[in-house]
């Protein structure tokens, strides 16, 4: 019950935080106009990943496209990437959980396929979360970088006569919807992790018990497995039936995927 | 069609106060209060976002004059205290247009201050 | 505050005559983020209110006769006038568009020669 609710509740978590992801991605406000010590100002600007925009006094907002992709700087370039491959993982991770929920039956998949998939997914998430995490802080950085330069020379005089007052720009709000949608996102595949351990419980390895009988050996395994005659009528330890449970062989080749969660 | 109509002006005391008025019709999304005293040029008074209230005003009227508006009346209005000879002044009430333009103004409103 | 300088005060003109008149700002009125210079243009005839002529400093109210232009980028602008008409005597301002407060120019005359 506590595996599915963790499950359920990292995939509603990583949801919520893709969707941020995507909404930070295609918002405007990234930079917005530093207004100084003034609240109202007649001409603002704001600009996003993929367009600048003007909003006048008067109402009036202009917006307009970057139609050049050589003559951005690389640094929007990297960003932009970094939110894109962000949304493909997670938009590629939600389509593996759905299928990996524990409350979902799809035909005869086993729980192990399952606890894959949701590790699979689990990580996505978590790589998602980083890529957009990194993409704003990039994108942050480059501000505070810009800031502190259009500061120094805030004022540059024309002549000594004419002023011209340099535009300075701060962190907009989609920066802050995509650091927690980041964070979300990652939180949610951590669950994810942590759900998938709950899914492929770990065996606890007792020793085989033998029974020494006048006429047969018996062996007892525990695990699901059919006991085992000493004439070796099932040497192979087959599964009878499937409960997650799995042979020594089969645990030791999963160390790597529970591990180092 | 946007139309302004101004009411309110007259003739007041010095030190006195009066309401000036502008009935708006039509889409305003902000408005802005300009006055020109008799002979001189165009002073900017005041500005209000009519969605939001908004508002800011030129030094020289900060404190004494204020910019508000009635949504169900759909009126703007100019409140003036502590009023001095120079605001002696034709008010005109005016929409702020694409590119922060004034492009509709009303007929103006004659304030005279004297004793 | 942005101070706008307009030169001449007042003019003498003849009907067909080409006219311009100069405003100069302290601040430059371009906009980096549309490129956009907010200056305005406006004529205001004796005892009416003023007439919004030009706005983002080239931009041509609808309505408004093409001999009307305007240009100029930065701190310095200026308003044409291809081939002045009777209507055209008035009195001209240049406004800061850009930032608050808003001001005006002291305002052009132009008067018949």
């Known amino acids: 019950m506590a595996v599915t609710a963790c499950q359920g509740l990292g995939f509603v978590v990583s949801l919520i935080g893709i969707a941020g992801i995507i909404a930070a991605t295609c918002m405007d406000q990234w930079s917005t106009q530093d207004l100084y010590n003034n609240p109202v100002t007649a001409v603002f600007n704001y600009q996003g990943l993929w367009r600048s925009c003007v909003r006048e006094s008067s109402g009036f907002t202009e917006c307009r496209g970057y139609f050049t992709l050589l003559g951005l700087p690389a640094m929007l370039q990297a960003v932009r990437a970094l939110m894109i491959v962000g949304i493909v993982l997670g938009a590629i991770g939600l389509l593996v959980s759905i299928f990996a929920l524990k409350c979902i039956r799809i035909g005869s998949m086993e729980d192990s396929a399952k606890a894959n998939m949701t590790l699979t997914s689990g990580i996505m998430f978590i790589v998602s979360g980083l890529c957009a995490i990194a993409g704003v802080s990039v994108f942050a950085n480059m501000l505070v970088t810009n800031f502190w330069m259009s500061t120094a020379n805030m004022y540059t005089g024309m002549g000594g006569m004419v002023q011209t007052v340099q535009t300075r720009y701060t962190f907009g709000a989609a920066l802050f919807v995509g650091w927690v949608a980041g964070g979300l996102t990652l939180i949610g595949g951590v669950m994810m992790c942590i759900a998938c351990r709950g899914l492929a419980p770990e065996e606890t390895n007792y020793k085989a018990v033998s029974y020494h009988a006048s006429g047969h050996s018996v062996a007892y395994k525990p695990g699901g497995f059919k006991a085992s005659t000493g004439f070796g009528s099932n040497t192979k330890n087959k599964k009878i039936y499937d409960g997650g449970a799995r042979t020594e062989d089969e645990v030791q080749s999963y160390p790597s995927k529970h591990d180092y969660v | 069609e946007v139309q302004l109509v101004e009411s309110g002006g007259g003739l007041v005391q010095p030190g006195g106060s009066l309401r000036l008025s502008c009935a708006v019709s039509?889409?305003?999304?902000?408005m802005n209060w300009v006055r020109q005293a008799p002979g001189k040029g165009l002073e900017w008074v005041a500005w209000?976002?009519?969605?939001?209230?908004?508002?800011t005003y030129a030094d020289d009227f900060k404190g004494r004059f204020t910019i508000s508006r009635d949504d169900s009346k759909n009126t703007l209005y100019l409140q003036m205290n502590s009023l001095r000879a120079e605001d002696t002044a034709v008010y005109y009430c005016?929409?702020?247009?694409?590119?922060?333009?004034?492009?509709?103004w009303g007929q103006g409103t004659l304030v005279t201050v004297s004793s | 505050d942005i101070q706008m300088t307009q030169s001449p005060s007042s003019l003498s003109a003849s009907v067909g005559d080409r006219v311009t008149i100069t405003c100069k700002s302290s601040?430059?009125?371009?906009?980096?983020?549309?490129?956009?210079?907010?200056l305005t243009w406006y004529q205001q005839k004796p005892g009416k209110a003023p007439k919004l002529l030009i706005y983002w400093a080239s931009t041509l109210r609808s309505g408004v006769p093409s001999r009307f232009s305007g240009s100029g980028s930065g701190t310095d602008y200026t308003l044409t006038i291809s081939s002045l008409q009777p209507e055209d005597f008035a009195t001209y301002y240049c406004?800061?568009?850009?930032?608050?407060?808003?001001?005006f120019g002291q305002g052009t005359k132009v008067e018949i020669k």
């Open positions: 406004q800061n568009a850009y930032s608050f407060p808003f001001t």
């Open positions: 601040q430059s009125l371009l906009n980096s983020g549309n490129i956009k210079s907010y």
């Open positions: 209000i976002n009519m969605y939001t209230g908004e508002r």
């Open positions: 039509g889409y305003t999304f902000s």
């Open positions: 005016a929409r702020l247009y694409r590119g922060n333009s004034l492009d509709y």
